[in-house]
Amino acid sequence: DAHKSEVAHRFKDLGEEHFKDLVLVAFSQYLQQCPFEEHLKLVNEVTEFAKTCVADETAENCDKSLHTLFGDKLCTVATLRETYGDMADCCAKQEPERNECFLQHKDDKPDLPPLVRPEVDVMCTAFQEHEDTFLKKYLYEVARRHPYFYAPELLFFAQKYKAAFTECCQAADKGACLLPKLDELRDQGKASSAKQRLKCASLQKFGERAFKAWSVARVSQRFPKADFTEVTKVVTDLTKVHTECCHGDLLECADDRAELAKYMCENQDSLSSKLKECCEKPLLEKSHCLAHVENDEMPADLHALTDDYVESKDVCKNYAEAKDVFMGMFLYEYSRRHPDYSAMLLLRLAKAYEATLEKCCATADPHGCYAKVFDEFQPLVEDPQNLVKHNCELFEQFGEYKFQNELLVRYTKKVPQVSTPTLVEVSRNLGKVGTKCCKQPEAKRMPCVEDYLSVVLNQLCVLHEKTPVSDRVTKCCTESLVNRRPCFSALEVDETYLPKAFNAETFTFHADMCTLSEKEQQVKKQTALAELVKHKPKATNEQLKTVMEDFAAFVEKCCKADDKEACFAEEGPKLVAASETALA
């Protein structure tokens, strides 16, 4: 349905509050360095303009596209050239090239100071005195640090953030109430950001077909009672929503997400028996709930997959007539029967099946050629099963911190050219897979482990893309989305790497180490471990374990000393010398 004014249409659909919040998120994700006040000014100007268009859709400029309106507004920022350098050149372009240019300048790791959490009383005062500004600051700070955060979901997080302050600022012990809630929101927010980053990467780097295939697998697992027609509808709408959000079209994205939620709730009977509770909630909670809904029970009477995809005489005919539909159906049928498989494994199976049909349907005896195709799936299935078994055993043996260290050593040896902060961050996140997934029942372990690893490895890929240093990382990241994890798993020690020269500064520690939180201390130790491996890539795990134990003892000893700084200055070089000997 055509609207005279797109901005008026979205303002009316979303309402003023959501409209303003989404425009703030959009601007903050594009101009990540701009001060909060500058963004608020831009948002207010856009909102006032939108209101004039609601009053009269034929008013001047109201017929312009949202990209044109928002881009023009962003290009009025006076310090664009000084703050953003060549991003200012985007403003010389016309739409749609201008928006594409802005998108290309989004920075996954912006140079911003880490967020410091003020005292609880300070936060509560700020919340109570200026609630609206306080919440908008939250949106701004998260959006600028996570330029691909799923915007309608960020509004949901802001709602949870508000609820936490509303409840806890009236509690007897504000801190005990608030801090755990903020920690949980922070962790959930980081996870949500990383998951969305993978969706955007899959759309932008591998195209709509790749995203749709992934969505067919996930939606079919969630809604095994839905027919393929219904799954196709949900997947098509979902793809539109994520394409819009990943493309910076946040108003359209939020509006279409609300429409999809409405459709799903109106069609629960043909989708899933698990949607009822979600559909009783208000909009933001409803959409969040639907996105995280548990898998429905599998229908009891599903016939054998081999009937249609191996035994049928029409396999090649059906495949040739409509390849995408036939493959979509295969993926749907396989996925709804296998909630115990990861989405990535299901996509690999579909890829293997398609490759077999391509080969066999061109032969004189197609059926004889593809008769054993399902047997070829066995090694593909066993690979992630072994990955889960092996890594969960390690996690149970070591615990999270030592498991992270094990992974850090493993990945530093695979790709030693990658920067130490990136290796530490990625390995820490990879290690969290144990805590998140290994306690799950057997049937949920593989989807949890492998799909989580895909999210984390995508973080490595996007960080590496910003400053590429390793051909091996580039290869694993770009060749195949579904084979990224197996590609990284298969990497052996990089024998071509020349050990990094020893730098005493890297292994010099001070008394400030003692005042760090446990997490910060771990990061410091893990940074030293990665540097150690880069210096001595041939070191065995046993040798590294010994050095790390010595290091932990050294920190503990000096942090108990009366003159901490003197202890670090004196004992540090001794530790380095002993480590050099141990690793010789």
């Epitope: 027919d227 393929f228 027609t229 219904e230 196709t232 509808k233 043909s270 059906n318 159906m329």
Partner: nanobody
Framework: EVQLLESGGGLVQPGGSLRLSCTAS????????MGWVRQAPGKGLEWVSW????????YYADSVKGRFTISRDNSKNTLYLQMNSLRAEDTAVYYC???????????WGQGTLVTVSS
Amino acid sequence: EVQLLESGGGLVQPGGSLRLSCTASGFTFRHYRMGWVRQAPGKGLEWVSWIRPDGTFTYYADSVKGRFTISRDNSKNTLYLQMNSLRAEDTAVYYCAKSYMAGTFDYWGQGTLVTVSS
């Protein structure tokens, strides 16, 4: 090539019954959602009813609920629409349609005319 052939239309009095049939060929019938769409004189297309591939779930427009029954026989590649208690407003061309995505259809037949008149 996909073909859908409707039959069973005709002239019937208000309150009467008709059974429409649709024979399908050129695709794997049991894989697809099938339905009936109608177009009354001077009006747009309207979904009347649809049925899932395995026949376990059916949808009916509010205007026909309780009067029309959709069914399918996958072994015969045939779709049916049993229409009871027919009304003058049911007069339309009825098309058998193959659906690839909920709310849309990619193929439909030539149609069969149903006229309800005294």
